[in-house]
């Protein structure tokens, strides 16, 4: 990895739990200031593998609301607008980091957690296993 | 929102910056322990809107490595294996949370940051603007 010289102005880290427990500023810096939030908002309907978005809420998690995609059809929409079952709609998934309140119900203490979310769907050629 | 009774065993939060600055345990809890990491590993090749994965590394960020998807073609692969430019391959994007070292180069102090990542690609019908 890349070794970076430590900044002398860093907060004190003499905590016995260091480096497992760190300080995190929750004032979110958004790097996407010039992006249009509606950019991909209609892909879920225009895709050949359209999806529905389901709200997943958990007050013990930060962010508390995550939207999960579920493919609308098993197959994919063809040029005629019909579902073609020779193809499969599949979810595109990503592991993301969230903060889980730990101990539970604590406002200022969290643990990093990795969860798998479905972001949208794509159309793939199915894997067909032929019997000998 | 849902009001949750505070746990009396929570860490002390008399910090003047509370609740902006919180304690986070970096021992990641993985909720996907029984998931197969190879599950969607070949979708990028089997999709009608295939994509390439590019490594984005930043030692000042946690996680330091993020994989970005870039659609391989402008159009989508048709049944004959050719690119059909009547359709568009588009990236499915998601805003995710990462930790940014702040001040820079500090091992135990971070700020939450929201970044936009492309997870994969899907095939959509293009929006055609007709001229009057």
């Amino acid at each position: 990895g890349i070794t970076i010289p430590r900044n002398p102005g860093c907060p004190n880290s003499e905590d016995k739990n260091f480096p497992r427990t760190v300080m995190v500023n929750l004032n979110i810096h958004n790097r996407n200031t010039n992006t249009n939030p509606k950019r991909s908002s209609d892909y879920y309907n225009r895709s050949t593998s359209p999806w529905n978005l389901h709200r997943n809420e958990d007050p013990e998690r930060y962010p508390s609301v995550i939207w999960e995609a579920k493919c609308r059809h098993l197959g994919c929409i063809n040029a005629d607008g019909n579902v073609d079952y020779h193809m499969n709609s599949v979810p595109i998934q990503q592991e993301i980091l969230v903060l889980r309140r730990e101990p539970p119900h604590c406002p200022n203490s969290f643990r990093l957690e990795k969860i798998l979310v479905s972001v949208g769907c794509t159309c793939v050629t199915p894997i067909v296993h032929h019997v000998a | 929102g849902i009001t949750i009774p505070r746990n009396p065993g929570c860490p002390n939060s008399e910090d003047k910056n509370f609740p902006r600055t919180v304690m986070v345990n970096l021992n990641i809890h993985n909720r996907n322990t029984n998931t197969n990491p190879k599950r969607s590993s070949d979708y990028y090749n089997r999709s009608t809107s295939p994509w390439n994965l590019h490594r984005n590394e930043d030692p000042e960020r946690y996680p330091s490595v993020i994989w970005e998807a870039k659609c391989r073609h402008l159009g989508c692969i048709n049944a004959d294996g050719n690119v059909d430019y009547h359709m568009n391959s588009v990236p499915i994007q998601q805003e995710i949370l990462v930790l940014r070292r702040e001040p820079p180069h500090c091992p135990n102090s971070f700020r939450l940051e929201k970044i936009l990542v492309s997870v994969g690609c899907t095939c959509v019908t293009p929006i055609v603007h007709h001229v009057a």
């Epitope: 999960e68 609308r72 059809h73 197959g75 079952y85 479905s118 | 996907n32």
Partner: antibody
């Protein structure tokens, strides 16, 4: 009203063949996904095969190469041709209708019992 | 191959809430459906696509699905709800339908 009724079950020797039929009314077979699901005595449900509205067919690994699903659009019926039958194929066979999305089966027949035994 | 796991049996008293779970690898990314099968009868769809109740199914039946677990909840359970319950989904990886092993609900 939607109805499905299976027929063709019975006692058959191992290695033999049998053809199951599913007569339907109240809907068009060719516009829906039609499936066969079986249930061995005292056991749970096991999916066997499906023919989608576009004619695409899929089979469970346990029957692939031995069973063939088909539909007769003119008679609005579903069939399952079962060859090289084994003792483990003994079950009640249900035909079921799948809806547009394909994710679930909304109507089931009353089932027909197939017994494979010597 | 994809597998679903259900508890073999669940017991409740009349009027109580029965909760039947169905677990599978990242089941929340798929739609789960539930079927009720009374002894000697054909299966009946009681919940489709996670939380959609078909017409004719009482409001006491509800469903949810996220993470690795789908849940069928029967509030104010009645003696007539005593039956086997099967969860079902479709596996993207194999293009096959999958049923859970079933849960026997006993209303004491």
């Amino acid at each position: 009203q939607v109805t499905l009724k299976e027929s063709g079950g019975g006692l058959i020797q191992p290695g033999g063949s049998l053809r199951l039929s599913c007569a339907t009314s109240g809907f068009t077979v060719s516009s829906n996904h039609m499936s066969w699901v079986r249930q061995a005595p005292g056991k749970g449900l096991e999916w066997v095969s499906i023919i989608y509205s576009d004619g695409t067919t899929y089979y469970a690994d346990s029957v692939k190469g031995r069973f063939t699903i088909s539909r007769d659009n003119s008679k609005n019926t579903l069939s399952l041709q079962m060859n090289s039958l084994r003792a483990e194929d003994t079950a009640v066979y249900y035909c079921a209708r799948g809806r547009y999305s394909g994710w679930y089966f909304d109507y089931w027949g009353q089932g027909t019992l197939v017994t494979v035994s010597s | 191959s994809y597998e679903l796991t259900q508890p073999p049996s669940v017991s409740v008293s009349p009027g109580q809430t029965a909760t039947i779970t169905c677990s599978g690898d990242d089941l929340g990314s798929k739609y789960a459906s539930w079927y009720q099968q009374r002894p000697g009868q054909s299966p009946v769809l009681v919940m489709r696509q996670d939380d959609q109740r078909p017409s004719g199914i009482p409001e006491r039946f509800s469903g949810s699905n996220s993470g690795n677990t789908a849940t069928l909840t029967i509030s104010g359970t009645q003696v007539m709800d005593e039956a086997d319950y099967y969860c079902q989904t479709w596996d993207h990886g194999t293009s096959k339908y999958v049923f859970g092993p079933g849960t026997k609900l006993t209303v004491l």
